[in-house]
Interface confidence: low
């Protein structure tokens, strides 16, 4: 068979643990555009939330902002909490890098983490009694 | 600056590009638990959304589910759209891995991608005319 050489621009796969271990460039490519969020949105959510800082130096990104619903009910047009409605968290699984072995500056392991991004409002379950 | 000695258990940082390039174990640590979402939630959101599949085989994760708000207004308790309220997207920046250089099997770069996770409801801006 013909040996197809790896492009000279590729790092050597001398790591005996390849494909389990790969090389990752931490210089982030930022293709995302900032979220457009008018500054007064947060005061106008019907299911508002606060953001809590979750910091872990053994993780990359080390800071994750976690949303926490401010109320169990939802805020109506008059600004009052309506307990007939419910504020519920919206969660998403994200990818982070965890230092492994711990405290090593150059060695990480992929980890999936569930984070709460915000809250939304749901109407209650209505059970019709026949 | 003081050079902080690496723990003896850490892999050698022979990569001349350290700290930009690090070694990553792809065996995912999955500490997260699946989001608990009762099956009937989606029918009860006041700002419902649909999920669109965003697929890119050159990225990890290759499939990202993007939320798209179903209405411009919000759904009231009677199940009708209320145009005095607005459904707005909740966005989050996530990390993905992209092959770089493109043709290398063992070399990746972190990339930030903005995704829409769900939608929430906001009350309109009320301008008081004096």
């Amino acid at each position: 068979g013909i040996m197809i050489p790896q492009s000279p621009g590729c790092p050597k796969t001398e790591d005996k643990n390849f494909p389990q271990h790969v090389r990752v460039n931490l210089n982030i490519l930022n293709r995302s555009t900032p979220a457009r969020r008018p500054s007064d949105y947060s005061k106008r959510f019907t299911s508002p939330w606060t953001l809590q800082r979750n910091e872990d130096p053994e993780r990359y990104s080390s800071v994750i902002w976690e949303a926490k619903c401010s109320h169990s009910g939802c805020i109506n047009a008059e600004g009052k909490e309506d307990h007939h409605m419910n504020s519920v968290p919206i969660q998403q699984e994200i990818l982070v890098l965890r230092r492994e072995p711990r405290h090593c500056p150059n060695s990480f392991r992929l980890e999936k983490v569930m984070v709460t991004v915000g809250c939304t409002c749901v109407t209650p379950i209505v059970r019709h009694i026949s | 600056g003081i050079m902080i000695p690496q723990s003896p258990g850490c892999p050698k940082t022979e990569d001349k590009n350290f700290p930009q390039h690090v070694r990553v174990n792809l065996n995912i640590l999955n500490r997260s638990t699946p989001a608990r979402r009762p099956s009937d939630y989606s029918k009860r959101f006041t700002s419902p959304w649909t999920l669109q599949r965003n697929e890119d085989p050159e990225r990890y994760s290759s499939v990202i589910w993007e939320a798209k708000c179903s209405h411009s207004g919000c759904i009231n308790a009677e199940g009708k759209e209320d145009h005095h309220m607005n459904s707005v997207p909740i966005q989050q920046e996530i990390l993905v891995l992209r092959r770089e250089p493109r043709h290398c099997p063992n070399s990746f770069r972190l990339e930030k991608v903005m995704v829409t996770v769900g939608c929430t409801c906001v009350t309109p801006i009320v301008r008081h005319i004096s």
């Epitope: - | 792809l26 085989p57 891995l97």
Partner: nanobody, 119 residues
């Protein structure tokens, strides 16, 4: 429904050759990198080779470089592995896999085909 069906395995003497085939269906074959993965008796899974969507680029684990060749025919939705100069340590069940760009992540694979290298 995604289906991957391997064939072509068998018993071969050291130094011999085999050609494995994989018939794919249920997805857009030409949009995905494809892989061969193997599992030797009593061992874990080992990534063997990968071929990019258009067949222009191939990668191999060091132990098979120069002996194995991965190829594909997008018109036939088929993946191949030409195995030459076979050694006893190549004895394994070989799986064809569709996957993510990360070399460990395969979302689908076939039932496998057994390759035994023995005199």
């Amino acid at each position: 429904e995604v289906q991957l069906v391997e064939s072509g395995g068998g018993l071969v003497q050291p130094g011999g050759s085999l050609r494995l085939s994989c018939a794919a269906s249920g997805f857009t074959f030409s949009s995905y990198s494809m892989y061969w993965v193997r599992q030797a008796p009593g061992k874990g899974l080992e990534w063997v080779a990968e071929i990019k969507q258009d067949g222009s680029e191939q990668y191999y684990v060091d132990s098979v470089k120069g002996r194995f060749t991965i190829s594909r025919d997008n018109a036939k939705n088929s993946l191949y592995l030409q195995m030459n100069s076979l050694r006893a340590e190549d004895t394994a069940v070989y799986y064809c896999a569709k996957g993510e760009i990360l070399p460990l992540y395969f979302d689908y694979w076939g039932q496998g085909t057994l390759v035994t290298v023995s005199s």
